[in-house]
Interface confidence: medium
């Protein structure tokens, strides 16, 4: 599902982002997970794919090309195109699930034919086919008859699933393992900095023991913790200092309107 | 040290079956972070990716749609190996046809372990 | 498809210089989807590079792989005797997975 890039360099155009981050270079940050993500590339006006570190970076990355989109190109939810009610569903949303062979842990969703809806599975990052959409607007848009869903979505939660650092298995063919449930982090409202500044702070997957620092947006400080090397998420960095630089502006303290990403 | 064993005849007739195995020593066919594959190479095509099957607590494929209505892959657990099966062949069959394996590895992935090849003309 | 086009088709060189193999995907692939093969006559391919830039087991470290998105490098610092061969670059990223034409180093 990735969205075809150009064969060349354009000039940088006069079209203005809609946010100054959407100006910044994509930045894979120090770690070494291997997260597809999206950033909006200024020379070419299109968002486009790169591979995320795990931790740091900037705030030009996006989980879904559908949000890079929304947040960094001028009009683009007034003119993406809906599906006609009536259209016909293409051939590949009859495809049976794919996580495909790679080893991420990337939350998709497809068109289940069963149920007729479209549901969440777990794609590991490549390989996998067609019936796989990066957000479940876009899966229904594409799959799900508009006519037929008005019922809720049939959600597979993320819980069924264990990851042993290698590839998704279903939680039945693991030894008692479950993945713990994160906690609930403070609401949007009370700040305006990198959503990834609210994460809780997460050790990862492997087995070494790297002393990072997260910002606990309760406190407004930012505290130490050990990360095991891989995984996590990105609220995770080297310094005190880069924490606070990272998260510290984000917090209000007086009420305003409005929302930034 | 992983090795693939290829087996199966090198001479088919037109509109026959071409049939192929891969014998797997040092890993598992059942393997939940490999991929087990078949490419075939000739000078007109070059190497061209035919499919694979791997398993995530369930059986996948995946099978390139020039072949796709006349492929099969079929794991064999009890004896650690897979098959190619590919129907109606015509003379544009003939090529060297090789297994691998595909590795996801911390990288990304790539075919690190291939089997001997195994020239098949399709000839009457 | 996502279509690999390798350049040049043949490269001549002598042992000890620098062979720059590139391959151009039609499509971005980013960068942990790319792997180089080295093929010789009567054998099959050998994995060199995957996810661009990292090298198989045992391959030299002479052997460097570059690039993300749409053009990657296959880089031999210093041409051994046992290095002419045809290389292969092949995408991992989508199905179909698909190889280039190759690229032949040959001897000068």
């Known amino acids: 599902l990735s969205e075809e890039a150009d064969d060349t360099d354009s000039e940088l155009g006069s079209m203005k982002p809609l946010h100054t981050f959407c100006a910044m270079k994509a930045d894979d940050g120090p770690c070494k997970a291997m997260i597809r993500s999206y950033f909006f590339n200024m020379y070419t006006h299109q968002c486009e794919e790169f591979i995320y570190g795990g931790c740091e970076g900037n705030e030009n990355r996006f989980d879904t090309l559908e949000e890079c989109k929304k947040t960094c190109i001028p009009g683009y939810e007034k003119t993406a195109v809906k599906a006609a009610s009536g259209a016909e569903r293409p051939d590949f949303c009859f495809l049976e699930e794919d996580p495909g062979l790679c080893r991420g842990y990337m939350k998709r969703y497809l068109y289940n034919n069963q149920t007729k809806q479209c549901e969440r599975f777990v794609y590991g990052g490549c390989l996998g086919n067609r019936n796989n959409f990066e957000t479940l607007d876009e899966c229904k848009k594409i799959c799900e008859n508009p006519v037929h869903s008005p019922s809720p979505v049939n959600e597979v939660q993320m819980s069924d699933y264990v990851t042993d650092g290698n590839t998704v298995t279903d939680r039945s063919t693991v030894n008692n393992i479950v993945v713990p449930q994160s906690p609930k982090v403070p609401r949007r409202r009370d700040y305006r900095g990198r959503p990834w500044c609210l994460q809780p702070a997460d050790s990862g997957l492997c087995k070494a023991s790297e002393r990072r620092f997260y910002y606990n947006s309760a406190t407004g400080k930012c505290h130490r913790f050990n990360y095991t090397g891989c995984g996590g998420n990105n609220n995770n960095f080297t310094t005190r200092r880069r924490c606070l630089r990272s998260c510290k502006t984000g917090l209000i303290k007086n009420k305003s309107k409005g929302v930034v990403k | 040290q992983v090795q693939l064993q290829q087996s199966g005849p090198g001479l088919v007739k037109p509109s026959q079956t071409l049939s192929l195995t891969c014998a797997i020593s040092?890993?598992?066919?059942?393997?939940?972070?490999?991929?087990w594959g078949w490419i075939r190479q000739s000078p007109g095509r070059g190497l061209e990716w035919l499919g694979m099957i791997y398993y995530r607590s369930k059986w996948y494929n995946s099978y390139a749609v020039s072949v796709k209505s006349r492929i099969t892959i079929n794991p064999d657990t009890s004896k650690n190996q897979f098959s190619l099966q590919l129907n109606s062949v015509t003379p544009e069959d003939t090529a060297v046809y090789y297994c691998a394996r595909t590795m996801s590895k911390y990288g990304g992935p790539g075919m690190d372990v291939w089997g001997q090849g195994t020239l098949v003309t399709v000839s009457s | 498809d996502i279509v690999l086009t390798q350049s040049p088709a043949t490269l001549s060189l002598s042992p000890g210089e620098r062979a720059t193999l590139s391959c151009r995907a039609s499509?971005?692939?980013?960068?942990?989807?790319l792997a180089w093969y080295q093929q010789k006559p009567g054998q099959a391919p050998r994995l060199l590079i995957y996810?661009?830039?990292t090298r198989a087991t045992g391959v030299p470290a002479r052997f460097n792989g570059s690039g993300s998105g749409t053009d990657f490098t296959l880089t031999i610092s210093s041409l051994e005797p046992e290095d002419f061969a045809v290389y292969y670059c092949?995408?991992?990223?989508?199905?179909?997975?698909?190889f280039g034409q190759g690229t032949k180093v040959e001897i000068k």
């Open positions: 092949q995408q991992l990223n989508s199905i179909p997975v698909t």
């Open positions: 499509q971005n692939i980013g960068s942990n989807y």
């Open positions: 040092g890993d598992s066919v059942s393997s939940n972070s490999a991929a």
């Open positions: 996810g661009a830039s």
